[in-house]
């Protein structure tokens, strides 16, 4: 499966959106940075077989997706960023599941590294656990937004390095 | 691949108020912080401030706050420095800098540095 | 303002040799997790190189015998061995807290 080159460029605008929901300042959030212990390994492309990439990439964009779906993320970001945000992820799940589907037929490894898929689910609960216990403060959702950026950009990392696979 | 390209060496008068920019080229300019570093000959490194070319948003190092303005224009991929009421501590050379990794706030691609001379 | 000192402000080793920088902040610049302590490399008439992020990261594309270390407040950067072309300035840079600070630099000479 190809992955399409709009959907690089849904990540980038997804990037983008990230960037723009600042609400205030990450300079006043300095002291309440954290290590999320971003599970870099997962990042590179070059450990994994395509399919295991491709789904390393989905569960990522579903977390990403999921975390900003609550209720608590509605009420500290500005509506209609918000909105383009969650449609760009959408779109790029989309894209994901299509090359799923194709590249199981194509390889007859396992569909998911389960590791894999799950150092990214115990990354997200970290990022969980961290606004639960800032009680979803505006700073707490600062250090969450850059940390989602890091993590964005790590996927657009991987997502070159599969597209240079092909 | 990453560029910072900074304008040209400046020779202003005390008093006076000089603009340097700085042109982004290889990666996505709204979605890196652009810090500004001023160096004066022989010394080590200060840091100015930094701004977010995607919202204009600044920060500023209090020493600088009244010294230097910052702005972006995000259709020419450039930063803008803007320094102010010109002293001879003002001669120096400064550098717009790439944000690295978000909110570690260091610094990977510099660019060659803009030369201000302050001079009666 | 946080202020690093770095010692020694130059230093002379023999090729080969170890070179080892210290950086020590007034205040800790180290919470959950991260050290916000990083390190450049300068050459005469260049710009600044980064070489090491969050107090131990080799930055991609630097060499393995560069390498950073501490937390806290102390930190340290070494260069096993030190080539010919590691004759540079080197500064430590924080960003625990505003305003980000340098250090006065340490100038390493090549015997």
């Known amino acids: 499966c190809d992955l399409p080159q709009t959907h690089s460029l849904g990540n980038r605008r997804a990037l983008i959106l990230l960037g723009q929901m600042g609400r205030i300042s990450p300079f006043s959030c300095l002291k309440d940075r954290h290590d999320f212990r971003i599970p870099q390994e997962e990042f590179d492309g070059n450990q994994f077989q395509k399919a295991q990439a491709i789904s390393v990439l989905h569960e990522m964009i579903q977390q990403t997706f999921n975390l900003f779906s609550t209720e608590d993320s509605s009420a500290a970001w500005e509506q209609s960023l918000l909105e383009k945000f969650s449609t760009e992820l959408y779109q790029q799940l989309n894209d994901l599941e299509a090359c799923v589907i194709q590249e199981v037929g194509v390889e007859e490894t396992p569909l998911m590294n389960e590791d894999s898929i799950l150092a990214v689910r115990k990354y997200f609960q970290r990022i969980t656990l961290y606004l639960i216990e800032r009680k979803y403060s505006p700073c707490a959702w600062e250090v969450v937004r850059a940390e989602i950026m890091r993590s964005l950009s790590f996927s657009t990392n991987l997502q070159k390095r599969l597209r240079r696979k092909d | 691949q990453v560029q910072l390209q900074e304008s040209g060496t400046v020779l202003a008068r005390p008093g006076a108020s000089v603009k340097m920019s700085c042109k982004a080229s290889g990666y996505s300019f709204t979605t890196y912080w652009m810090h500004w570093v001023k160096q004066r000959p022989g010394q080590g490194l200060e840091w100015i401030g930094v701004?977010?070319?995607?919202?204009?948003?600044?920060t500023y190092n209090q020493k600088f706050k009244d010294k230097a303005k910052l702005t972006a224009v995000t259709s020419a991929n450039t930063a803008y420095m803007e320094l102010s009421s010109l002293t001879n501590e003002d001669s120096a050379v400064y550098f717009c800098?790439?944000?690295?990794?978000?909110?570690?706030?260091?610094?990977?691609?510099w660019g060659q540095g803009t030369t201000v001379t302050v001079s009666s | 303002d946080i202020v690093l000192t770095q010692s020694p402000a130059s230093l002379a080793v023999s090729l080969g040799q170890r070179a080892t920088i210290s950086c020590r902040a007034s205040?800790?610049?180290?919470?959950?997790?991260?050290?916000?302590m990083h390190w450049y490399q300068q050459k005469p008439g260049q710009t600044p190189k980064l070489l090491i992020y969050?107090?131990?990261n080799l930055e991609s594309g630097v060499p393995a015998r560069f390498s950073g270390s501490g937390s806290g407040t102390d930190f340290t950067l070494n260069i096993h061995p030190v080539e010919e072309e590691d004759a540079a300035t080197y500064y430590c840079?924080?960003?625990?807290?505003?305003?980000?600070?340098f250090g006065s630099g340490t100038k390493l000479e090549i015997k």
């Open positions: 800098t790439r944000n690295y990794k978000y909110d570690y706030y260091t610094m990977d691609y």
């Open positions: 701004i977010y070319p995607g919202n204009g948003d600044t």
């Open positions: 840079q924080h960003s625990g807290e505003l305003p980000f600070t």
């Open positions: 969050l107090a131990s």
């Open positions: 205040k800790s610049v180290s919470t959950s997790g991260h050290s916000y």
